[in-house]
């Protein structure tokens, strides 16, 4: 029986993009006093972990620490809360959280088609490319929870490239891109070198969020 209580939250610290062999903590939390949390990873196998809830300051929470991240632990996670010892009385699921392992393959190159400094209002396109035959590129912006993603296409010079149109420039930001293969969507390359895009004629330095994020993330609340 599912959905007796409202959904808990699930977040990753320090973030959901985790370097290979590094540590990540997945935290389930709620203002409902859950006795247990069930952390479940989507997939063909039943990877579910039962965690004991800790209660502090009107919040129940449980941490799952992955001391060394591997491909076998990447994937989409959800958290459920439970107020009794019965495994059948669980809350609605948290929003899904994609945990991605990064740093597995060679880094792609990231460039701005008109150069890294643009005039306000000018259309900005960032290009991610590599000699590796990546199927997909993921573009992240510092301070944003979501990445944009586009399929890679082969170019005549033997590279595989995706062009990300960001629209008219209003604010700057620091961007990175990653490559991945279609058979392993949670396994990404090393990060490209960061690209700082500056917009002249505008003092602010934060790009508007993409209207349709391509990937899911957890509530950006801090760990307790």
């Amino acid at each position: 029986h599912e959905g007796v209580h409202r959904k808990p939250s699930l977040l990753a610290h320090p973030g959901r993009l985790v370097k290979s062999e590094e540590t990540v903590i997945l935290q389930c939390w709620s203002d409902v006093m859950f006795e247990h949390f069930l952390l479940h990873r989507e997939g063909m196998f039943n990877d579910t972990l039962r965690l004991i809830g800790e209660h502090h300051d009107g919040v129940s929470k449980a941490n799952f620490s992955i001391s060394r991240m591997t491909q076998d632990l990447a994937g989409t996670y959800r958290c459920y809360g439970s107020v009794t010892h019965s495994p059948y009385q669980v809350s609605a699921p948290s929003d899904p959280l994609d945990i991605v392992i990064i740093g597995l393959y060679e880094k792609p190159s990231l460039s701005a088609q008109l150069g890294p400094t643009v005039l306000a209002g000018e259309n900005v396109t960032l290009s991610c490319s590599s000699r590796s035959s990546y199927d997909m590129y993921h573009l992240s912006r510092e301070g944003e929870a979501h990445e944009r993603r586009l399929p890679a296409g082969p170019k005549v010079n033997g590279t595989f490239q995706a062009d990300f149109p960001l629209g008219p420039a209003t604010h700057g930001g620091t961007y990175r891109c990653f490559g991945s293969f279609h058979d392993s969507p949670y396994e990404w390359s090393k990060s490209s070198d960061p690209l700082l895009v500056s917009v002249t004629g505008n003092p602010s330095n934060s790009w508007p969020s993409p209207t349709e994020p391509s990937s899911k993330t957890g509530n950006p609340r801090h760990l307790h």
């Epitope: 062999e21 579910t48 076998d72 632990l73 058979d183 392993s184 969507p185």
Partner: antibody, heavy 116, light 108 residues
Framework: QVQLVQSGAEVKKPGSSVKVSCKAS????????ISWVRQAPGQGLEWMGG????????NYAQKFQGRVTITADESTSTAYMELSSLRSEDTAVYYC?????????WGQGTLVTVSS | EIVLTQSPGTLSLSPGEGATLSCRAS???????LAWYQQKPGQAPRLLIY???RRATGIPDRFSGSGSGTDFTLTISRLEPEDFAVYYC?????????FGGGTKVEIK
Amino acid sequence: QVQLVQSGAEVKKPGSSVKVSCKASGGTFSSYAISWVRQAPGQGLEWMGGIIPIFGTANYAQKFQGRVTITADESTSTAYMELSSLRSEDTAVYYCARSRSYFDYWGQGTLVTVSS
Amino acid sequence: EIVLTQSPGTLSLSPGEGATLSCRASQSVTSSHLAWYQQKPGQAPRLLIYGASRRATGIPDRFSGSGSGTDFTLTISRLEPEDFAVYYCQQYGSSPLTFGGGTKVEIK
């Protein structure tokens, strides 16, 4: 370099059980899945099941459900496969292998002979 | 479960020749979750290809994989003496994980 070292050959009577071990070194044991694959003499490969030690829950092929138990001891970086109610058709080389998808590292294999 | 059928059962070839091995699935293999292994007598299998076409670490580029859906191929461009062995395909897109029956590549 990842290494999977399995226990030695076993000869068992029909109806008994066998427990094969697989000790891992050179990698992050608790964060990688370990699967068990068997190969009867002159035959193909057959996946039995697998476990991610950090999760602790094993998954089994339907064919072996109820007869096989896969466990892992994080403190010794060792995975175990126990097969019960042995019959002559269980005579095979049993391999442990890393992952539950494609298998990039394999143990050397353990021959289990079931004979009366 | 997904049944993988490999053909031919045996391939008799000479060193220097090319080899084409086929693996057909009874239903579509999701996201090209198909691997190829090489096994020599008395040894554990060795991973050659995963993701249908991605070569495993240290595998020579004379080995290549292709295909999607239900039809997959392993190609060995020029057979070296050490390539004579049994080759297995394996799908890992759905549980249970399954292997093909194998193709033996023998010296003609």
